[in-house]
């Protein structure tokens, strides 16, 4: 009945509603139907959120923070529905709401506890800083404070640096991990316990490939089944690192099934893509193609990074000419 938020029943006429920042929610309240309905929603027993009586809204003394953000289900009041539709919730809206309903038969009071969560999609980045390599798991806006865990080759790592910036609304969090010289696979999990939402970033380093000039190279990129759900929208990006920064070679959007290729020697196999295999070919290699190639498969729930190191060596012909 109430699709915009989920709520948990707890004792004493009190329910917990969990909403997401900037989304609409419903604070539920029901009563035994009767005539002469009076409905008063209040926040923290002090601030007037919404009043309805004598068949219409009375918002003259509504607290300004709720202006144009609240409404009732007017066609359902006579059926005992006093629920409040609440637009664009913010973290400042968290707290206890009391719904007073009076009718010709009875008066009831319901309490609803509103909790608001934020979870902007995190990202996993691979960065080179001088001679060091770092994996960084970051989330731009999250509330409450998330749980971040790292694993190396599926074994939890205790070392977990967290750089946190708090704003009025939420936290911004970076968790960097130094992976210099490592060939292990790494996994970072960020969990928002309130919203029951988990995001996972996984990084895998493939064996280095040695190729001759003018040859072509095939670089594999297949999602791990544990994370990958083909029904979910995702994006695949292939990029190459040159002098510390990545330049995008190509990307694919699952929603539109669009492929954009920025490098003419790059090719993707359409049939393989349909089988969720995003391996790529790079033709006619030259010496400047040496470097790190990164495949990034990302959705709202995961980021899968696969890194290949390619060494392009001069062909025999080129060497003998020199």
């Amino acid at each position: 009945i109430f699709p915009l938020a989920f709520f948990i029943y707890v004792p004493m006429n009190e329910q917990i509603v969990i909403g997401r920042l900037d989304e609409d929610i419903i604070l539920p309240s029901s009563f035994e139907r009767g005539s002469e309905v009076v409905i008063h929603w209040k926040y923290q027993d002090s601030y007037k959120v919404h009043s309805y009586y004598k068949g219409s809204d009375h918002l003259e003394s509504q607290d300004p923070r709720y202006a144009n953000r609240t409404s009732l289900f007017y066609n359902e009041i006579q059926n005992g529905n006093a629920s409040l539709f609440f637009r664009r919730v913010s973290l400042l809206d968290e707290g206890i709401y009391t719904c007073y309903v009076g009718t010709a038969i009875q008066v009831i009071t319901n309490k609803v506890v509103l909790k608001v969560g934020v979870f902007l999609t995190p990202v996993m980045k691979y960065e080179k800083r001088n001679t060091n390599s770092f994996l960084i798991c970051s989330v731009l806006s999250v509330y409450p404070r998330p749980i971040i865990t790292w694993k190396m080759d599926n074994t939890p790592i205790s070392e977990n640096n967290m750089e946190e910036t708090g704003s009025l609304d939420s936290f911004s969090i970076n968790s960097p991990l130094n992976i210099t010289g490592s060939n292990s696979s790494y996994e970072c999990t960020i969990e928002n316990s309130l919203l029951k939402q988990t995001w996972t970033g996984r990084w895998t380093m493939k064996d280095g490939l040695h190729k001759m000039q003018s040859e072509h190279v095939s670089l594999s990129c297949q999602p791990v089944n544990d994370y990958f759900s083909p029904n979910q929208d995702f994006k695949v990006t292939w990029s190459r690192m040159k002098s510390g920064t990545f330049s995008v070679l190509a990307y694919y959007l699952s929603s539109s099934q669009n492929t954009i290729i920025n490098e003419s020697r790059f090719s993707w196999n359409k049939e393989l893509i349909n089988q969720s295999d995003f391996s790529m070919n790079l033709m006619d290699l030259n010496l400047s193609d040496s470097g790190e190639y990164l495949c990034n498969i990302s959705s709202d729930e995961y980021t899968l990074l696969t890194i290949h190191t390619v060494h392009v060596e001069p062909s025999q012909e080129t060497a003998s000419h020199n």
């Epitope: 002469e36 009076v38 008063h40 209040k42 004598k54 003394s61 007073y100 009076g102 010709a104 008066v107």
Partner: antibody
Framework: QVQLVESGGGVVQPGRSLRLSCAAS????????IHWVRQAPGKGLEWVAV????????YYADSVRGRFTISRDNSKNTLSLQMNSLRVEDTAVYYC??????????????WGQGTLVTVSS | DIQMTQSPSTLSASVGDRVTITCRAS??????LAWYQQKPGKAPKLLIY???SLESGVPSRFSGSGSGTEFTLTISSLQPDDLATYYC?????????FGQGTKLEIK
């Protein structure tokens, strides 16, 4: 059963003050708005003031605004009407009456028996 | 303020009669009207709310009708116990106002 009992009436000189009380029982006091309604001897009924269930909203008739103050103590189930600068025309039986619900409806389901206030020099 | 005018001021009727009291508002009050009965020396008693809804415990010989500015209270068969003064009251808006009352006498 619902009971409202007024007290505090008496004879007072013009310009003086008086405080009326109303003791409520038989219902959850903090759920209901309570009104004061008065009736001058041999005359009709006149609404005086209302205080809503939680005490934050108070409304007054023009004839008493600025002179009378309505208040309540939900922990003691009592209602008060502080009457200042009394005038001869304030002479009446004062009734406390319970609203249908919060105080927002504005009609009177249960009444006390009233207390007489006489303003006379 | 909204003015409420009742008619007649006094009404004399016999037991068993059908009695009608009228109340007129100076402006539309939708159906936000109540009727009270006050017996001599007693507090008023709610009979009708929302123009036509009978309060719990009130005998069914009492009924109310009307909306906007014209309202009536009807006693279908007058009983000796109905000797009282009857008041209408608007609760559309503050200040709530009463009619001046209709005194009902039994012949």
């Amino acid at each position: 059963q619902v009971q409202l009992v007024e007290s505090g009436g008496g004879v007072v000189q013009p310009g003086r003050s008086l405080r009326l009380s109303c003791a409520a029982s038989g219902f959850t006091f903090s759920d209901y708005g309570i009104h004061w309604v008065r009736q001058a001897p041999g005359k009709g009924l006149e609404w005086v003031a209302v205080i809503w269930y939680e005490g934050s909203d108070k409304y007054y008739a023009d004839s008493v605004r600025g002179r009378f103050t309505i208040s309540r103590d939900n922990s003691k189930n009592t209602l008060s009407l502080q009457m200042n600068s009394l005038r001869v025309e304030d002479t009446a039986v004062y009734y406390c009456a319970r609203d249908r619900s919060s105080g927002a409806m504005g009609y009177f389901v249960y009444w006390g028996q009233g207390t007489l206030v006489t303003v006379s020099s | 303020d909204i003015q409420m005018t009742q008619s007649p001021s006094t009404l004399s009727a016999s037991v068993g009669d059908r009695v009608t009291i009228t109340c007129r508002a100076s402006q539309s009050i939708s159906s936000w009207l109540a009727w009270y009965q006050q017996k001599p020396g007693k507090a008023p008693k709610l009979l009708i709310y929302k123009a036509s809804s009978l309060e719990s415990g009130v005998p069914s010989r009492f009924s109310g009708s009307g909306s906007g500015t014209e309202f009536t209270l009807t006693i279908s068969s007058l009983q000796p116990d109905d000797l009282a003064t009857y008041y209408c009251q608007q609760y559309q808006s503050y200040s709530y106002t009463f009619g001046q009352g209709t005194k009902l006498e039994i012949k």
